[in-house]
Interface confidence: medium
């Protein structure tokens, strides 16, 4: 507990002090007082630097004095032999004796008193910025007129803050301008304009005189402008170092003027005004702004129209323009909207073809479609090159978005048939020689693939089975091999309307219009072993002459087997119809004269016993295209015959081309 005075005596005083003692006394007087310590008696063993025995006076970590030896007063009227005065309210006295004393020493006697200190004069650092007033136990600071004492109760400043300027134009100056501004002040001014206007500050060079920066470039006094998260300054020195006009891009500006304790500079004066908030004029190579202006400000509205091939990214799909308003914050409304290149997306894939992966799917990009050659060719779409158009579609050279169509190449066998003779009397064949050859398993018969969805065959093949199962792509029709070949399922069977349906088909003598179409459920995939045969053209070039050669193939009866399990083929010449008429019908169902011969039939064969026979029905009689020697067309279909190994009759397909095309068109798969 602090006391105003007290006495301190060495151990055993006034008797001799003991050896090997260390004792300390903590003196504390009230706050605001110093301590005056008086020694009235001193008798301590003398040694150099008082190393043996001593009394030490400490103020914190600072040694105020160290005493030893004998002292007597110089003043006969006063007992004081030594004194110490400190301006602090705490002091420590420490007494120490060593292990031996050669003589008897009595030690010391001392007392202390609390003394007033003059804070205004006793310290190196002045406690007050302006006026210091001492009193017993303390001091207080005061200020000159127009100054006020800050909350720290030590510093005086000018009351220059709190002004809010809302007028669209105005002038602000430092306190006392153009007289020197007060030291040790922080002046804050606020400019608050209505939204949509930005504060523009103008400071003329000659209107600015603020204490210059120190040697390290730090402003001692400074003027700072703060607008939102941007700061202009700090500024100081003679002559304004900033730009003539400061465009703050904000309707709110705080002006902060901070001064230190010294200086005699005149300060500053500024003008401000509110400009409608500008919005940035953007460089937009992908759009056009209407109206076009050198500068856009608050409340301006522009229509942004995307250039051809560009579109608005967000918002309505496919929008090509939008409106934008210059907002009070200096930002455009709809700023998220941008004109970006139209994206056509990944090109659509096509059946039996592919597209080159475009480098990009944006406006102007190019891709190329190709068909799976050599089995398909492009029916439309020119050379297959498409580009991403401004409407977001991939279009061809004709600017049509219609996708290319890959259609099967017809009539081209992957390997030409080379019969060992010129399927009775025929040779072994490979399905690659006759990729159009279709196998019907019930009844055992043939057909010709003419399109990915259509098989042409003889009417008598399908009249008893309206849901035939067919196979393509296999040379062998053995059960074990067929399981691995491509099975085709029929969707619908179209028998020519001219084919007469009989109660007892076995008794048939009229095979006129022996032609039918089978529509398939699913499209056939073309390849080296599966391809369609062409239809005959309608021109006279496709009229068959006697002696013209055609190829037949099938799995029908041969000399050796009732059913050939491997494909057989033969090349036969066209013969006059009378040749077929002249052959005696084997096991006739009726009188020979009852058998009907019509112009819808082709007679062929008669050479070296080569002929089609049971099980070959519906297969193609394939003739080389007169206008393209690489291709074959289906001139006939195996229909009937008087006797295997002689002449055979084939349905003349040329007479049915219109019916075939019409049926396929009317029943086309979407």
């Amino acid at each position: 507990e602090p006391t105003m005075y007290g006495e301190i005596l060495s151990p055993n005083y006034p008797q001799a002090y003991p050896s090997e003692v260390e004792k300390s006394w903590d003196i504390e007087v009230p706050e605001g007082y110093g301590i005056h310590l008086y020694f009235t008696h001193l008798d301590i063993e003398l040694s150099e630097n008082c190393a043996y025995d001593s009394v030490q006076i400490m103020s914190g970590d600072t040694e105020e004095g160290r005493l030893c030896g004998q002292r007597t007063s110089n003043n006969p009227h006063s007992p004081i032999v030594e004194e110490f005065q400190v301006p602090y309210n705490k002091l420590q006295v420490i007494f120490k004796s060593d292990f031996s004393n050669e003589e008897r020493f009595t030690g010391f006697a001392a007392y202390y008193v609390a003394t007033d200190i003059n804070e205004c004069t006793d310290f190196v650092d002045a406690p007050c910025s302006h006026f210091c007033n001492n009193f017993i136990g303390g001091y207080f600071c005061s200020c000159p007129p127009e100054y006020f004492l800050h909350d720290d109760m030590k510093n005086c400043g000018v009351n220059c803050s709190g002004d809010v300027f809302t007028a669209l134009i105005g002038e602000i100056a430092s306190p006392n301008y153009p007289k020197p501004y007060p030291e040790n002040s922080r002046c804050e001014y606020q400019i608050r304009l209505e939204k949509g206007f930005q504060v523009v500050v103008t400071v003329r060079r000659e209107d600015f005189d603020v204490e210059p920066a120190d040697s390290e470039g730090n402003c001692l006094d400074s003027l700072v402008f703060v607008a939102g998260d941007q700061q202009f300054g700090p500024y100081c020195g003679r002559g304004f170092p900033g730009p003539l006009n400061i465009e703050t891009k904000s309707n709110a500006l705080d002006i902060i003027f901070q001064t230190d304790l010294t200086g005699q500079n005149k300060g500053w004066k500024l003008r401000y005004h509110g400009d409608p908030m500008p919005c940035p004029k953007e460089e937009t190579p992908t759009s056009v702004w209407e109206p076009a202006k050198a500068k856009y400000v608050f409340k301006d509205v522009v229509r942004i129209t995307c250039l051809d091939g560009f579109e608005v990214v967000e918002g309505r799909v496919g929008a090509t323009s939008f409106h934008s308003t210059c907002q009070s914050n200096g930002k455009w409304s709809n700023s998220k909207l941008k004109c970006q290149p139209v994206d056509c997306g990944i090109p659509e894939s096509i059946e039996n073809g592919k597209f080159e992966d475009p480098e990009s799917t944006l406006f102007g990009s190019v891709t190329r479609y190709t068909c799976e050659e050599p089995y398909y060719y492009m029916e439309n779409g020119g050379n297959g090159q498409y580009h991403c158009a401004s409407n977001g579609s991939w279009v061809n050279e004709a600017l049509s978005p219609e996708l290319p169509k890959c259609v099967p190449v017809c009539g081209v066998p992957r390997e030409p048939f080379e019969g060992k003779q010129r399927i009775i009397g025929g040779s072994d064949a490979d399905i690659k020689n006759f990729p159009w050859q279709v196998f019907f398993d019930n009844p055992w018969a043939g057909g010709a693939l003419i399109d990915e969805y259509w098989v042409l065959t003889a009417a008598h093949v399908v009249e008893g089975n309206q849901e035939p199962t067919m196979y393509v792509g296999s040379t062998s029709v053995q059960t074990s091999r067929l399981a691995k070949s491509k099975m085709l399922t029929s969707e619908r069977v179209f028998i020519h309307p001219g084919w007469k349906l009989l109660e007892v088909p076995e008794a048939r003598t009229n095979f006129d219009n022996d032609i039918a179409l089978v529509q398939l459920k699913d499209p056939v995939k073309m390849g080296p072993t599966v391809a369609p045969i062409c239809l005959p053209g309608t021109s006279s070039d496709y009229n068959l002459m006697d002696g013209d050669l055609g190829l037949i193939a099938g799995w029908g009866r041969t000399e050796k087997r009732d059913r050939a399990l491997r494909l057989k083929a033969a090349m036969l010449p066209v013969a006059p119809l009378r040749k077929c008429r002249e052959v005696k019908v084997e096991n006739p169902k009726a009188d020979a004269g009852a058998y009907v011969f019509t112009p819808n039939m082709i007679c062929a064969g008669g050479e070296k016993g080569m002929d089609s026979c049971k099980g070959d029905s519906g297969g193609a009689f394939a003739v080389q295209d007169p206008n393209d020697k690489t291709k074959f067309y289906v001139a006939g279909l195996v229909s009937w015959g008087p006797q295997c190994g002689t002449y055979g009759l084939y349905t003349r397909v040329q007479n049915y081309v219109d019916w075939i095309k019409k049926t396929m068109q009317e029943n086309s798969t979407p």
Partner: antibody, heavy 119, light 111 residues
Framework: QVQLVQSGAEVKKPGASVKLSCTAS????????IHWVKEAPGQGLEWIGR????????KYAPKFQVKVTITADTSTSTAYLELSSLRSEDTAVYYC????????????WGQGTTVTVSS | DIVMTQSPDSLAVSLGERATISCKSS??????????LNWYQKKPGQPPKLLIY???NLESGVPDRFSGSGSGTDFTLTISSLQAEDVAVYYC?????????FGQGTKVEIK
Amino acid sequence: QVQLVQSGAEVKKPGASVKLSCTASGFNIKDDYIHWVKEAPGQGLEWIGRIDPADGHTKYAPKFQVKVTITADTSTSTAYLELSSLRSEDTAVYYCARYGYGREVFDYWGQGTTVTVSS
Amino acid sequence: DIVMTQSPDSLAVSLGERATISCKSSQSVDYEGDSYLNWYQKKPGQPPKLLIYDASNLESGVPDRFSGSGSGTDFTLTISSLQAEDVAVYYCQQSNEDPWTFGQGTKVEIK
């Protein structure tokens, strides 16, 4: 389903003739081939021959060329085997069979007809 | 004519044991990589039943303990685990060339 039904057992005197029938159902006889096979007592199986009912075209094993005649009537879906100049060695069970699809086999058989030649 | 010879003429095998029948032809019954050799099972009072076609293909509905192998002139029918209902006469038959011919048959019995 496919079925071949044969005529009943026959007992004949030597020198006589006999005509066995085989009626097909479940398939169209004119689209197929009907074969005949002999099984003599204590002997194995022997192929006799076949017919294409659509045109009556026949093939015979050389051994039976003279002995047998195979015919067919598509209107009744029936095939016939006629044995002439019967002798005791003609005593056997005679089977008709259908020629298989996609493999060179007999896939369906009749139940067999027993012919006994005895004086 | 192609002559087909089976061996043995008869075979007695314990139930569950393997039975193997051999069939040799006087000339090859192969054509373009396929063997036209079939196996039939014949039980008394019943028509023959197709087991194996084209030398090694199992006919639909036939138990898989029956298997066939071979090519050219040498063929084998194997019953991997003989069952009581397998007692019968087994015939091989070639269908590569007219006339179609059968082997003399092999009788399989239970030991």
